[in-house]
Interface confidence: low
Amino acid sequence: SEVEYIAEVGQNAYLPCSYTPAPPGNLVPVCWGKGACPVFDCSNVVLRTDNRDVNDRTSGRYWLKGDFHKGDVSLTIENVTLADSGVYCCRIQIPGIMNDEKHNVKLVVIKPAKVTPAPTLQRDLTSAFPRMLTTGEHGPAETQTPGSLPDVNLTVSNFFCELQIFTLTNELRDSGATIRTA
């Protein structure tokens, strides 16, 4: 069964996929599609690459933000909605008959749980779950604890998701390591 990845409505979803170019720099075409990987190509293509760059995106919300030239073709879907839920196929189109690598991943989009804690609890909650702020779309994660919040949007899963993805990505980016999350 597919590995599940959870994202909240309005947040960015990250679906990992990677390969090792052999020899290094010898990139191969990749497609991402909505729906399980079919026999050939991708169904309902959302993004496609060639040997040089992304050459087909059905929406500006779909991005490859990884180290593309090292084979990190993980898909980022910006500002997800409930309609983005479902199985996605990452197909690495290695030349030759039936050589393709196929990876099915499942995206589960959930509504954010809005919690309005009692005032006495508020400070403890914001300290325990500081909001994750990022510089740019995928810049270094900074942790900030807001001072006084009359209404705390406590998105615990989002906090851990962003903490895991952004810090891991930034730590490994320049090392050239392949980023895999489960």
């Epitope: 040997n51 992304v54 490859l64 030239h69 740019g136």
Partner: antibody
Framework: EVQLVESGGGLVQPGGSLRLSCAAS????????IHWVRQAPGKGLEWVAD????????EYADSVKDRFTISADTSKNTAYLQMNSLRAEDTAVYYC??????????????WGQGTLVTVSS | DIQMTQSPSSLSASVGDRVTITCRAS??????VAWYQQKPGKAPKLLIY???FLYSGVPSRFSGSRSGTDFTLTISSLQPEDFATYYC?????????FGQGTKVEIK
């Protein structure tokens, strides 16, 4: 150590030709993009062309399209810029620089020392 | 083509000053912006890539940030070796384009 060394610059008459070379060492150009960037005297930086030797993709600025040709020889680890029909406005220091295959990461982390091209009669 | 409007074109500052240079893209470039430093007669050097990432070996007094299509290079405490010309560049679409440069001079 990563190094880029340009050569081939000089004085040429309008309408003439020059071939610039960019010899790379310390890395395999087939894994990267190689860019040519120029700088006219006292002016800013202008991108000219790029090539991804591993994939064979080439791109050009409109100002040089159909006049300049970028190429690479991976066996020599060298990129070239063939400049034809040169004009006075092509006078500049020409730098080669190393970039990356995917444009989202394609900043230029290593640059050559530059070679001066002067187009004048 | 995407225009990168850089400001100011020049500035005078003293050692220890905090210096801010801005670049505005004429359309969305995501985080595909780099900053370079160039000294007279020398090739440019990469300082910041992907809008906010400090390039290896660059002093931590340099930082970059993004707000929409506005990009900022900040030098927190100007040092004597920082007097140079600085360029922003977008590499989101072809052709890659540079800002016109900001010359940082000694006051």
């Amino acid at each position: 150590e990563v190094q880029l060394v340009e050569s081939g610059g000089g004085l040429v008459q309008p309408g003439g030709s020059l071939r610039l070379s960019c010899a790379a060492s310390g890395f395999n150009i087939g894994n990267y993009a190689i860019h040519w960037v120029r700088q006219a005297p006292g002016k800013g930086l202008e991108w000219v062309a790029d090539i991804t030797p591993g994939q064979g993709y080439t791109e050009y600025a409109d100002s040089v399209k159909d006049r300049f040709t970028i190429s690479a020889d991976t066996s020599k680890n060298t990129a070239y810029l063939q400049m034809n029909s040169l004009r006075a406005e092509d006078t500049a220091v020409y730098y080669c620089a190393r970039g990356y295959v995917y444009r989202m990461w394609d900043s230029y982390d290593y640059w050559g020392q530059g070679t001066l091209v002067t187009v004048s009669s | 083509d995407i225009q990168m409007t850089q400001s100011p074109s020049s500035l005078s500052a003293s050692v220890g000053d905090r210096v801010t240079i801005t670049c505005r893209a004429s359309q969305d470039v995501n985080t595909a912006v780099a900053w370079y430093q160039q000294k007279p007669g020398k090739a440019p050097k990469l300082l910041i890539y992907s809008a906010s990432f400090l390039y290896s070996g660059v002093p931590s007094r340099f930082s970059g940030s993004r707000s929409g299509t506005d990009f900022t290079l900040t030098i927190s405490s100007l040092q004597p070796e920082d007097f140079a010309t600085y360029y922003c560049q977008q590499h989101y679409t072809t052709p890659p384009t540079f800002g016109q440069g900001t010359k940082v001079e000694i006051k």
